[in-house]
């Protein structure tokens, strides 16, 4: 969380951003909130990016003002216009690109004053893993698959019964480049698994950490997965 204060002029307002990550090819949100003003027309929102000459986005007098918008963001940005009045200056970024990573500034002007806060935005690819029993294999084998990751992640297997055990000798992980030549499909196979145990496939890079769990018993198979972004720090 980054909290910024205006320094020019008599009054400053509090602006708060949260570092976040964007998933390549999907829509992302750059989070920013501020001390609200009572009239929408008194609020100006400017999003800027370090190293980019034009604006990322500008909202003033109750509507988007995109005449100064940089070409790389053309047609890809929007604020939540109905929430600006309650202090939400967050920016929706469509079709996130690898090159969207960097330092952004959320700059706010209201009738009370000015304020800004920076936001670190990372980009990459991350997806939920799915763990299945591989019935085609000669021995009891688990297969963990996740369709899109970038940068290349690490994959670690763990087991509830054999806590702390190192499964690197009995697992094999491969990374297959996807058709857009950036993201990769992750496939990891774990051999010699035992019944009545819960196994976890953990995939992690510097942006996200995802876990797929599978519990195999004689009567049923239970699966669970979750994904966590690693750099959600507020400013």
């Amino acid at each position: 969380l980054i909290i910024g204060f205006g320094i020019s002029g008599r009054h400053s307002i509090t602006v708060t951003t949260v570092a976040s990550a964007g998933n390549i090819g999907e829509d992302g949100i750059l989070s920013c909130t501020f001390e609200p003003d009572i009239k929408l027309s008194d609020i100006v929102i400017q999003w800027l990016k370090e190293g980019v000459l034009g604006l990322v986005h500008e909202f003033k007098e109750g509507k988007d003002e995109l005449s100064e918008q940089d070409e790389m963001f053309r047609g890809r940005t929007a604020v939540f216009a109905d929430q600006v009045i309650v202090g939400n200056a967050s920016l929706r970024l469509k079709n996130v690109q690898l090159t969207d990573a960097g330092t952004y500034k959320c700059y706010i002007i209201t009738s009370k004053g000015k304020g800004n806060a920076n936001l670190e935005y990372k980009t990459g690819a991350f997806s939920m893993p799915e763990v299945n029993v591989d019935y085609n294999a000669s021995s009891e084998t688990l297969r963990c698959e996740a369709p899109r990751w970038f940068p290349q992640p690490t994959v670690v297997w763990a087991s509830q019964v054999d806590q702390g055990a190192n499964f690197s000798e009995v697992s094999n992980t491969s990374f297959e480049l996807n058709s857009e030549n950036v993201t990769m499909k992750v496939v990891s196979v774990l051999y010699n698994v035992t019944i009545n145990n819960t196994y976890s496939c953990m995939i992690e890079n510097d942006i996200a950490k995802a876990t797929g769990d599978i519990k195999v018993t004689e009567s049923e198979i239970k699966r669970r997965s979750h994904l966590q972004l690693l750099n959600s720090k507020a400013s």
Epitope: D37, I38, K39, D82, Q83, I85, V86, G87, N88, S111
Partner: antibody, heavy 122, light 113 residues
Amino acid sequence: QVQLQESGPELVKPGASVKLSCKASGYIFTDYTIHWLKQSPGQGLEWIGWIYPGSGHTHYNDKFKGKATMTADKSSTTAYMQLSSLTSEDSAVFFCARGGESITTVFPLAYWGQGTLVTVSA
Amino acid sequence: DIVMSQSPSSLAVSVGEKVTMSCKSSQSLLYSSDQKNYLAWYQQKPGQSPKLLIYWASTWESGVPDRFIGSGSGTDFTLTVSSVKAEDLAVYYCHQYYSYPPTFGAGTKLEIK
């Protein structure tokens, strides 16, 4: 139709806290601000602040910062206001009201609850 | 904070009469960007919660009888009841939402003779 149902009257001791509720129905709870106001014989109508249940954002009148805390529960479409360190000055009727339709301002206040009487007395 | 001053504090009129009440603000409520006055009028009947009558100084809230007329601009505003009915017995408040914190007048109490 839009309705705001407030909790019943409260008799509380000085120094204690009280939590008032405002149950909203008849509209999308997360799309509008809920405001709290105080009405006392000495001070008339005073605006305490608003909460936007969609995000949890709040905005307070400086006069009530530290005295009032507004929260909202989306699942039950209920807004709450806790008043702390109560004194006789806090004895009043408290209203919740829904913010306006426009995205250009959260006012005026077109829908009001029936009010909750809070009496602070030893 | 913007101070709202209402006058008179109370007045008594007969049914059918016309009545006017005044509201003055300590600074202009006319916003140059949209040429709107950020002022509302509320009616509060005995034992009830306030009810919105007028906003933007002169726009009727849905369902409000047209005998209630809001007028004025800048710092001086008026609420007129063209032909008072017995049910209009209430306190009338003006309210500015031009700047935070929004503030209310002390009210004008309308009594029926």
